[in-house]
């Protein structure tokens, strides 16, 4: 008899999830010599252990600690790039500026980027039909807790001048409810981080407003300053320049600036 399966509001686990994670891990460790020591089977086992057989609305950051431990990685000071609501452009940037890193350029972020997963209580099966939606079902689901965990860790380990790319086309340029606003901002360590520099990316071709004066940016400045971290903001126009460099990765002058 087919077993009854809980119906969640969100889409189910990405097809071929175990194979995808394992393949990504192998690829990452091949490309990044400093991570060659990582055993990808152990990584998958730790990943699986965080959510398999567990009620998918009761996942904790503790569940992911074995995985976090295996994926420990450090970013050089001044090279961390956070982002909010502008993922693709942030990734285009680090694709060109190879010495800067978003969370998705690190092993754990790379493994999980754009994937969905969940299991079921008391069974070893992966649920490919549906997974909990953050709004409609619960916030302590496997995907949300994963990103909260690794985002917290990413922010905690950042040092020097940290950059954040923000979407100037959104009504809330800085959103307190985003992962950046709710997790990363509060986990930057004042004793290690000397400044946060926000890059507000303008969308409009003819846009020449000063979005660094936006009330939500003032709010971000206030939060950061209260944490004894200096705050800077820059208007960034012509985001199409990022893609132009990405299209020609062989052009080394795109990488170095000049």
């Amino acid at each position: 008899l087919p077993r009854w399966r809980q119906q969640w509001s969100g889409s189910g686990t990405t097809s071929r999830f175990p194979e995808t994670v394992l393949a990504r891990c192998v690829k990452y460790t091949e490309v990044h010599p400093e991570m060659r020591h990582v055993d990808c089977q152990s990584v998958w086992d730790a990943f699986k252990g965080a959510f398999i057989s567990k009620y998918p609305c009761n996942i904790t950051e503790e569940d992911y600690q074995p995985l976090v431990k295996l994926g420990t990685q450090t970013v050089p000071c001044n090279k961390t790039l956070l982002w909010s609501r502008i993922k693709d452009l942030a990734h285009q940037f680090t694709q060109v500026q190879r010495d800067m890193f978003t969370l998705e350029d690190m092993l754990l972020g790379y493994l999980a980027d754009d994937l969905t997963w969940c299991g079921e209580f008391n069974t070893f099966e992966i649920n490919y039909q549906s997974c909990p939606d953050w709004r409609k079902d619960c916030s302590n689901n496997p995907v949300s807790v994963f990103w909260k965990t690794v985002s917290r860790r990413f922010a905690e380990t950042a040092c020097g001048v940290v950059h954040v790319m923000l979407n100037g086309s959104r009504s809330k340029i800085f959103d307190k409810n985003s992962t950046f606003g709710s997790v990363e901002v509060h986990n930057l360590q004042p004793e290690k981080v000397q400044a946060l520099e926000a890059w507000v990316i303008h969308g409009g071709r003819e846009d020449s407003r000063d979005l660094c004066q936006d009330p939500t940016i003032k709010e971000l400045e206030s939060i950061i300053s209260k944490r004894n971290i200096r705050f800077f903001c820059k208007n960034i126009y012509r985001p199409d320049k990022f893609l132009q460099c990405v299209k020609n990765p062989e052009d080394s002058s795109c990488l170095s600036g000049i």
Partner: antibody, heavy 120, light 108 residues
Framework: QVQLVESGGGLVQPGGSLRLSCAAS????????MNWVRQAPGKGLEWVSG????????YYADSVKGRFTISRDNSKNTLYLQMNSLRAEDTAVYYC?????????????WGQGTLVTVSS | DIELTQPPSVSVAPGQTARISCSGD??????VYWYQQKPGQAPVLVIY???KRPSGIPERFSGSNSGNTATLTISGTQAEDEADYYC??????????FGGGTKLTVLG
């Protein structure tokens, strides 16, 4: 190494036209915004026009809008500036300049310039 | 449009520090670039992104940008640094502006 060589300058009467060219080499031309900047004799620098790498976006200073047209041929690694309805105040050395990439909008490399003189 | 204001001239003794200012409304919200231009030559980028030095530019050149003012600092100024210096910024659309330029004179 990066090289930018302007040509096409000369003496032209007010109301006349001129087409400047800039031959680029030493970098992937289509990756960069390109610009024209001018300098009147004994005066400061003035940005004239810019064009994106693809080249779907063009920008003009108010002083030349409607009279000048910037264009590029990525297959020939060449930047152009078509100047119509020229005025005495357009007299200047015209420089072709390559933009910085990514978040920066300044000029990494400049040509040696070509002199445009508008006079009757 | 933002307007960039520079002093017309700055004088400095050899070996001393020269500071050239560039002011504009909320200039700290925009990246600033500095160019050196010697007579009869094309401008050369000496500082980009407020404070970054292109390769080949001596370490004595540095830049900063806070409040409404960006500053180009030349430490241990040498005779060869005598030139015109221009600041520049970009405030979107067709608003790419240069300051009026500062003539740096190295005395002696």
């Amino acid at each position: 190494q990066v090289q930018l060589v302007e040509s096409g300058g000369g003496l032209v009467q007010p109301g006349g036209s001129l087409r400047l060219s800039c031959a680029a080499s030493g970098f992937t031309f289509s990756s960069y915004y390109m610009n024209w900047v001018r300098q009147a004799p004994g005066k400061g620098l003035e940005w004239v026009s810019g064009i994106s790498g693809d080249p779907s976006n063009t920008y003009y200073a108010d002083s030349v809008k409607g009279r000048f047209t910037i264009s590029r041929d990525n297959s020939k690694n060449t930047l152009y500036l078509q100047m119509n309805s020229l005025r005495a105040e357009d007299t200047a050395v015209y420089y072709c300049a390559r933009d910085l990439p990514l978040v920066y909008t300044g000029f990494a490399y400049w040509g040696q310039g070509t002199l445009v003189t508008v006079s009757s | 449009d933002i307007e960039l204001t520079q002093p017309p001239s700055v004088s400095v003794a050899p070996g001393q520090t020269a500071r050239i200012s560039c002011s504009g409304d909320n200039l700290r919200h925009y990246y600033v670039y500095w160019y050196q231009q010697k007579p009869g030559q094309a401008p050369v980028l000496v500082i980009y992104g407020d404070s970054k030095r292109p390769s080949g530019i001596p370490e004595r050149f540095s830049g900063s940008n806070s409040g409404n003012t960006a500053t180009l600092t030349i430490s241990g100024t040498q005779a060869e640094d005598e030139a015109d210096y221009y600041c520049q910024t970009y405030t979107g659309g067709a608003s790419l502006v240069f300051g009026g330029g500062t003539k740096l004179t190295v005395l002696g």
